[in-house]
């Protein structure tokens, strides 16, 4: 029996004969911009842009069902036009057009905002683009804008605005010695400005021998006034002279003196925590310093909070190392020797691609990243020794590691 007439839209047919008898063959080629869809028994076999397919009449049926569907370019995205939103009322197939609008605060540059779906399934090259602009930068607290043009509302990506911190403020991260006050912010790709900030200049804390004896109006920040109340009323060294003022350059305008009534010496430090040793070559007078050290050579002297002992230091706690205590004018040791403990020091070879259990704590920078897959250089954690448990002492504990980015990090905030 003959096959029915072969009719394929958007295609050209080339048949072996005009008859549709058993064994007759036709080659189907889709027009440019259309894709061959080949089915057998209503099941899609393949979709191809390639040149043609041959169908054969077999027992009154064509052995394949063929259609030519328009190429689909799919909805355009930022790869076509950055910072734009697209509208495609005609769909996204061959020949159809989409228009785009620039998302605020980007602005259209050029006048043809249409894209056409091309025969190869790609969108036509845009003849316009969205130029991202930044609005006027927001005010930075305690800073003055130095660039006049930056008060306007249109700024190209990459352009800079210069600021200067007000007296008594400086750029964070710059040391008090360098006191950097000027900084620039840049208009970024997403139409926002890089953040800039000015933080108050601070003075160094007064010498530790005065610890606990002074009151300050605003900590050690610029303009703060710190005072020690003396009982003596000697005119040359009276009440007024034991006041110091933090200047805008980060230095004090003077220095404290020891009040006349502050005499004597600190008691001999005893009842030290285990392994701790104090050496006091200058005795125990006010201002005398005792060097702290640990009897075990590979331990370090550190300060722990009152209620924490060496045995129960959580891994996220990064205790402060301490190298000396000083006898204050209040005849107390600072820091108090009872708070000083000896903790096992870090082993060498942090960041060497071996996870050393002893270093897997904040105090040792989590072994330089060696215990987390996301931070170890080889991207594979190798415990050392091999018996170290990857769920136990050699587990990924670093709260900064990617492994913890979606977990509940309460309790890590101390570290």
């Amino acid at each position: 029996t003959d096959c029915p007439e072969l009719a394929v839209e958007n295609a050209s047919l080339n048949c072996s004969s005009s008859d549709r008898y058993h064994g007759a063959q036709c080659t189907v080629s889709c027009r440019t911009g259309y894709v061959l869809q080949i089915r057998r028994d209503d099941e899609l076999i393949k979709s191809q842009t390639g040149p043609s397919v041959t169908v054969t009449c077999t027992e009154g049926k064509w052995n394949k069902q063929v259609a030519c569907e328009p190429v689909d370019c799919s909805i355009p995205d930022h790869h076509q036009v950055y910072a734009a939103s697209f509208s495609c009322p005609e769909g996204t197939t061959f020949g159809s057009q989409c228009s785009f609008q620039c998302r605020h605060p980007a602005q259209l540059k050029g006048n043809n905002s249409l894209l056409t779906c091309m025969e190869d399934g790609l969108w036509s090259f845009p003849e316009a683009l969205c130029e991202l602009m930044c609005l006027a930068p927001p005010p930075v607290p305690n800073a003055d804008l130095q660039t006049a043009r930056c008060r306007e509302n249109k700024h190209k990506v990459g352009s800079f605005c210069k600021y200067k911190c007000k007296p008594g403020y400086h750029v964070p991260g710059s040391s008090r010695k360098s006191k950097k006050r000027a900084f620039k912010t840049q208009c970024t790709q997403d139409g926002s400005w890089q953040e800039g900030a000015c933080v108050p200049v601070t003075c160094d804390p007064p010498p530790p021998k005065f610890h606990g004896l002074y009151q300050c109006t605003n900590g050690f920040q610029f303009n703060s006034e710190c005072r020690i109340k003396c009982e003596d009323s000697d005119a040359s060294q009276g009440l007024g002279s034991n006041v110091i003022h933090c200047r805008k350059d980060g230095t004090w305008n003077g220095s404290f003196h020891v009040c006349q009534e502050m005499q004597g010496q600190c008691s001999v430090p005893n009842e030290l925590n285990s392994n701790l040793k104090l050496q006091c070559p200058d005795g125990y007078a006010i201002g005398s310093e005792c060097a702290t050290s640990c009897l075990d050579h590979n331990s370090e002297s550190i300060i722990l909070p009152m209620n924490v002992t060496v045995r129960d230091i959580p891994h996220w706690l990064n205790p402060t190392r301490v190298e000396r205590v000083v006898c204050t004018a209040g005849l107390k040791w600072y820091p108090h020797p009872a708070l000083i403990h000896c903790v096992k020091g870090c082993e060498p070879f942090m960041g060497d691609n071996y996870c050393d259990a002893i270093n897997n704590r904040a105090f040792c920078n989590y072994d330089g990243g060696d215990c987390c897959t996301s931070t170890v250089k080889t991207k594979k954690v190798t415990p050392f020794p091999m018996s170290c448990d990857l769920q136990g002492d050699c587990a990924c504990r670093d709260p900064q590691a990617q492994e913890h980015s979606r977990k509940d990090l309460r309790g890590y905030s101390h570290g």
């Epitope: 020091g345 870090c346 070879f349 942090m350 920078n365 250089k377």
Partner: antibody, heavy 118, light 107 residues
Amino acid sequence: EVQLLESGGGLVQPGGSLRLSCAASGFTFSSYAMSWVRQAPGKGLEWVSAISMTVGRTYYADSVKGRFTISRDNSKNTLYLQMNSLRAEDTAVYYCARVWGGVRFDVWGQGTLVTVSS
Amino acid sequence: DIQMTQSPSSLSASVGDRVTITCRASQSISTYLNWYQQKPGKAPKLLIYVASILQSGVPSRFSGSGSGTDFTLTISSLQPEDFATYYCQQSSSTPWTFGGGTKVEIK
């Protein structure tokens, strides 16, 4: 008194070999990692190699990897550096250093000069 | 590898001056930074470890500060015996690397 004393330096031709030794005294040698640091004439310090306390984990700078071998004999309180395939750029004073805790070189030897020249 | 950049490479100062040397790491090294002093013909000597801790026996005129990538060694009042070359060294990860050195000379 804590002391490190290097020996074994000298003049050697390019391609030649040399073995440096470092004798330790005044501390428990087996309780510390040890290291070699070198300094070319008129130049800065360059870390060369290190070895852990007892299990013998070894580390090398890329510039010497495959040519130098660090080792230790805890029974003799001695650190070694076997240097093969020596090059002119290996000319330097070689210091032996004790590694304390999370890596600081707290005790240094006086250094031994290695000159590689034809 | 972590690169360490010291500045300045040399400086001239007088006795009594306050001297500041900076060291910058190519990536964050937390506080794993040490400072050494070296005099001509001598071995280096450890001054400061973990960025700010003074090694035992080192005068308190030496101080260190910083964390992350930027570090500072300060000599509050330069003494005649302080004229030397100073090196920073990172111990955050192997290979351990030194800065190029800063030579402090007499003005």
